[in-house]
């Protein structure tokens, strides 16, 4: 058993049929010694008396809010949550496996630049009685500070018969050094509580591996005289690290016909303009990637040819 | 050229070669996710690689003030990786074909280090840890770790030379 926060405790249980469970001793936070009784949740049934209460925690029915009273007055509470371990593996019932980039990916994170700011998100089908708390650091043995905000519900989607809820959190490294080569990964830890079930999820990454620039901005076409060619130009996204002579991007320019089956013409360039042939009903798209490190491409910025 | 006396390197040449190094490093080990190398548990193997750290003066401001500290750090790293890529880690099994980008990577690391430090000038270099894994799986794991780490190192070096070529070239 360990303390998650004040008056909230997590009991770690090996979860299998007829498991013996864990013996837990609760102590009433009071100077009083006599006349103390214990109850669980809203029930008025007295579970025991005395300053301490010993219970055998085996299942969710044994978890909940234990309260000690004296003469009708509440003295203190202890909330017990359960953390299940099945076949040596901690349960992951609350969050959905996003399976990208690999199986058992519950948390996904992205950064728009090298400033040390990043966003993580996760998915669940649970809509109520759900709380999250997020902590992060750079490195684990001698951790350096990363400050995370509160997790918020950022999207709701219908998937077949189910509703899916996306939560996200923003974090910022306290003393980021955008130009340095990272040697210690960022660690992100999410505590999830659903009713009386506790689970924790972690992710470990370098900012360089989660970089995904915003799409190029101000995408414009300039027709070239007496030609089917156009000059496409664009700018670095505002959110990208500066100076651009140091934090450089590379770009992919694509000409795509109306039909998805039509052949795509692609050009790669380090410049912020390119000359392409504009076909009727086609569109021109541009996306960006770090020039020197192959992290994710941005989403496409697009304009129609006509 | 970045000689200890403090004259400038051939920024544009260094820029071109460092960008080529980036491309080669990703050709040699393109996969980001097929093995989470940090989960593999033998941390000591690549902990000794030289990293370009915050105080090394490789940020735009540090380069403007005095690029020598940064260039020395880059040179140190290039020599370190060049030695690793020429070692038994990359010559033993699993077999690399003669067309492997590792061969070109090895030659380009040497080329860039020579651009930074012509014959007759000496910056101190970092000791290479004596790693001689006997099993193919240990060797392959080390290769992947070294190449992932090299990708990060050459990315910073390429940024330095790109910025230098754009802002510090005479």
């Amino acid at each position: 058993i360990w303390e998650l926060k004040k008056d909230v405790y997590v009991v770690e249980l090996d979860w299998y049929p007829d498991a013996p469970g864990e013996m837990v001793v609760l102590t009433c936070d009071t100077p009083e010694e006599d006349g103390i009784t214990w109850t669980l949740d809203q029930s008025s049934e007295v579970l025991g008396s005395g300053k301490t209460l010993t219970i055998q925690v085996k299942e969710f029915g044994d978890a909940g809010q234990y309260t000690c009273h004296k003469g009708g007055e509440v003295l203190s509470h202890s909330l017990l949550l359960l953390h299940k371990k099945e076949d040596g593996i901690w349960s992951t019932d609350i969050l959905k496996d996003q399976k990208e980039p690999k199986n058992k990916t519950f948390l996904r994170c992205e950064a728009k630049n090298y400033s040390g700011r990043f966003t993580c998100w996760w998915l669940t089908t649970i809509s109520t009685d759900l709380t999250f708390s997020v902590k992060s650091s750079r490195g684990s043995s001698d951790p350096q500070g990363v400050t995370c905000g509160a997790a918020t519900l950022s999207a709701e989607r219908v998937r077949g018969d189910n509703k899916e809820y996306e939560y996200s959190v923003e974090c910022q490294e306290d003393s980021a050094c955008p130009a340095a080569e990272e040697s210690l990964p960022i660690e992100v830890m999410v505590d999830a509580v659903h009713k009386l079930k506790y689970e924790n999820y972690t992710s470990s990454f370098f900012i360089r591996d989660i970089i995904k620039p915003d799409p190029p901005k101000n995408l414009q076409l300039k027709p070239l005289k007496n030609s089917r060619q156009v000059e496409v130009s664009w700018e670095y996204p505002d959110t990208w690290s500066t100076p651009h002579s140091y934090f450089s991007l590379t770009f992919c320019v694509q000409v795509q016909g109306k039909s998805k089956r039509e052949k795509k013409d692609r050009v790669f360039t380090d410049k912020t303009s390119a000359t392409v042939i504009c076909r009727k009903n086609a569109s021109i798209s541009v996306r960006a990637q770090d020039r020197y490190y192959s992290s994710s491409w941005s989403e496409w910025a697009s304009v129609p040819c006509s | 050229r970045a000689v200890p006396g403090g004259s400038s390197p051939a920024w544009t040449q260094c820029q071109q070669l460092s960008q080529k190094l980036c491309t080669l490093a990703w050709s040699a080990h393109p996969l980001v996710g097929h093995m989470d190398l940090r989960e593999e548990g033998d941390e000591e193997t690549t902990n000794d690689v030289p990293h370009i750290q915050c105080g090394d003066g490789c940020d735009p401001q540090g380069l403007r003030d005095n690029s020598q500290f940064c260039l020395q750090r880059i040179h140190q790293g290039l020599i370190f990786y060049e030695k690793l890529l020429g070692s038994d880690i990359f010559t033993g099994e699993p077999s690399l074909l003669p067309d492997s980008p590792v061969g070109q990577l090895h030659a380009s690391l040497l080329g860039l280090s020579q651009l930074l430090q012509p014959e007759g000038h000496h910056w101190e270099t970092q000791q290479i840890p004596s790693l001689s894994p006997s099993q193919p799986w240990q060797r392959l794991l080390l290769r992947f770790k070294i190449l992932r780490s090299l990708q990060a190192f050459v990315a910073v070096a390429a940024r330095v030379f790109a910025h230098g070529a754009a802002t510090l070239s005479p």
């Epitope: - | 996969l31 699993p94 074909l97």
Partner: antibody, heavy 120, light 107 residues
Framework: QVQLVQSGAEVKKPGSSVKVSCKAS????????IHWMRQAPGQGLEWIGY????????RYNENFKGKVTITADKSTSTAYMELSSLRSEDTAVYYC?????????????WGQGTLVTVSS | DIQMTQSPSSLSASVGDRVTITCKAS??????VAWYQQKPGKVPKLLIY???TRHTGVPSRFSGSGSRTDFTLTISSLQPEDVADYFC?????????FGSGTKLEIK
Amino acid sequence: QVQLVQSGAEVKKPGSSVKVSCKASGYTFTDQTIHWMRQAPGQGLEWIGYIYPRDDSPRYNENFKGKVTITADKSTSTAYMELSSLRSEDTAVYYCAIPDRSGYAWFIYWGQGTLVTVSS
Amino acid sequence: DIQMTQSPSSLSASVGDRVTITCKASRDVAIAVAWYQQKPGKVPKLLIYWASTRHTGVPSRFSGSGSRTDFTLTISSLQPEDVADYFCHQYSSYPFTFGSGTKLEIK
């Protein structure tokens, strides 16, 4: 896109020789090794060897040394595999293939195969 | 030479079944193993490399696992178009060698 086009089927007498060609296109011929494999009827694959056109250096499976000669013609982007002193057990489909760009020998692109039949 | 012992040599399964093919290397090959599919009269097609990485365009029902000497190719839900021969291949050590193949049929 990368393509490997092999020469047509051959029927040969025991003791004779055969030269199979593999014309490459869609990439820089001198950049990558070209490998040869064979597959006897109803059998698995056997790796014969490769040529690196950049420096014309071949490498052979010891089991095929003296039996096989692999060459390359940079001017036509074509690799050749010559089999000598043919015997009935050399009857097989012969494939050329090129590996992944990372320098390890898993094979992404294959020729369509050339059936060599050795029969008296 | 490294022997790649592949089993079973043939198997028959129903559509939707989970199918497993194994390959045992005679010595450590790290994860330098690829798997190929060869349909009758066709050229071998790369499915998996580095023991577990799916090649571009290969359906997610195909997965690979293993390291050092023991390797597995799994088809999570067999489809009619999966009827073919399957070969493992080690590229750790010269001469590169292949398993003898598994002929997969639909019941």
